[in-house]
């Protein structure tokens, strides 16, 4: 009796179970009672990443420089090309089909984690004792200047956006 289901890595056609083509190969002709499934390797710049019965391989993704994309990993007959973003940009999605510039941390915030090709800058508020007076994609919060170590005194308190202002100690006695 003809099968109604086939084993893994097989497919049903004309009441017969045929072997699927392995990753990196496409289907040329189905098996018959007397012949095996005929498969052919994908050509350069094409791929198939699963056991399949596709008659055409897929084209590798094009990492379009117009969009700020570049090749992170060249595709093979079994894998697609992996794109990433140029320096200063990061992907807008996991599939990395477009890029946006890295976010800068505003004054009062410092960089907690520098951006990569796939993730944006992570900013954090400068805690007490630290400040950032610039908008930057790479600068961390900096500690306030220690006036005491310079034998000076604080003339103006620091904020999350400004450093303390040090000045000479008042030597006049009452």
């Amino acid at each position: 009796e003809p099968p109604t289901a086939c084993r893994e890595k097989q497919y049903l056609i004309n009441s017969q179970c045929c072997s699927l083509c392995q990753p990196g190969q496409k289907l040329v002709s189905d098996c018959t009672e007397f012949t095996e499934t005929e498969c052919l390797p994908c050509s350069e710049s094409e791929f198939l990443d699963t056991w399949n019965r596709e008659t055409r391989c897929h084209q590798h993704k094009y990492c379009d420089p117009n969009l700020g994309l570049q090749v992170q990993q060249k595709g093979t007959s079994e894998t697609d090309t992996i794109c990433t973003c140029e320096e200063g940009l990061h992907c807008t999605s996991e599939s990395c089909e477009s890029c946006v510039p890295h976010r800068s941390c505003l004054p009062g915030f410092g960089v907690k984690q520098i951006a990569t090709g796939v993730s944006d800058t992570i900013c954090e508020p400068c805690p007490v004792g630290f400040f950032s007076n610039v908008s930057s994609a790479f600068e961390k919060c900096r500690p306030w200047t220690s006036c005491e170590t310079k034998d000076l005194v604080v003339q103006q308190a620091g904020t999350n956006k400004t450093d303390v202002v040090c000045g000479p100690q008042d030597r006049q006695r009452a």
Epitope: D64, K74, E86, L89
Partner: antibody, heavy 129, light 112 residues
């Protein structure tokens, strides 16, 4: 001066193959992405294929995919289009074109795209029995 | 694929008069960096195409300032402030946002 010169066109029978070449001069070929664009007699422009500056990344129009292959030899400053299983509808003038760009520094390509800024004179391919 | 539609397909012009060509895309060509990835090309009779405008509104090197490009998103316009006899030919818009690149059908500009 900056120049692109196509060659390799001719009359060929359906099902046969042809290889077009595009010789570049006057600029650093290996720094530029390159395109093939074609124009059937009396028709508009049709984009065919693109290849990255290093040749690692390429893409073909659906109408030619699986039959045509774009490639390049940077040591010879030459772009190629290998055309197999030719059809009557592939009859056209084939142009190579350079993807213009500006700064090669950080974010250069992203912020400085200059269109297809240099085109060859074209080479004619006629597919006929 | 992005479909590019030009109008008019034929444009008879008088030298010295202005001319305008429209190009519409099936999806927005405005990218995250604020640029519109649309180019304009001119193919003069018997010649190869030549770049006129890139990124929607930037004139290519050597292009006379009577040519200007405008628009954003899906609607773009190429204007010639005062047409000259040498401006005859077929004008094409092309989107550069997606692979495959796609061209408009072309607008044939001829002297009346």
């Amino acid at each position: 001066q900056v120049q692109l010169v196509e060659s390799g066109g001719g009359v060929v029978q359906p099902g046969r193959s042809l290889r077009l070449s595009c010789a570049a001069s006057g600029f650093t070929f290996s720094s530029y992405g390159m395109h093939w664009v074609r124009q059937a007699p009396g028709k508009g422009l049709e984009w065919v294929a693109v290849i990255s500056n290093d040749g690692d990344n390429k893409y073909h129009a659906d109408s030619v995919w699986g039959r045509f292959t774009i490639s390049r030899d940077n040591s010879r400053s030459t772009l190629y289009l290998q055309m197999n299983s030719l059809r009557a509808e592939d009859t056209a003038v084939y142009y190579c074109a350079r993807r213009g760009m500006g700064s090669s520094g950080s974010r250069g390509d992203y912020y400085y795209y200059y269109g297809l800024d240099v085109w060859g004179q074209g080479t004619t391919v006629t597919v006929s029995s | 694929d992005i479909v590019m539609t030009q109008s008019p397909l034929s444009l008879p012009v008088t030298p010295g008069e202005p001319a305008s060509i429209s190009c519409r895309s099936s999806q927005s060509l405005l990218y995250s960096n604020g640029y519109n990835f649309l180019d304009w090309y001119l193919q003069k009779p018997g010649q190869s195409p030549q770049l006129l405008i890139y990124l929607g509104s930037n004139r290519a090197s050597g292009v006379p300032d009577r040519f200007s490009g405008s628009g954003s998103g899906t609607d773009f316009t190429l204007k010639i402030s005062r047409v000259e006899a040498e401006d005859v030919g077929v004008y094409y818009c092309m989107q550069a946002l997606q692979t495959p690149r796609t061209f408009g059908q072309g607008t044939k500009v001829e002297i009346k």
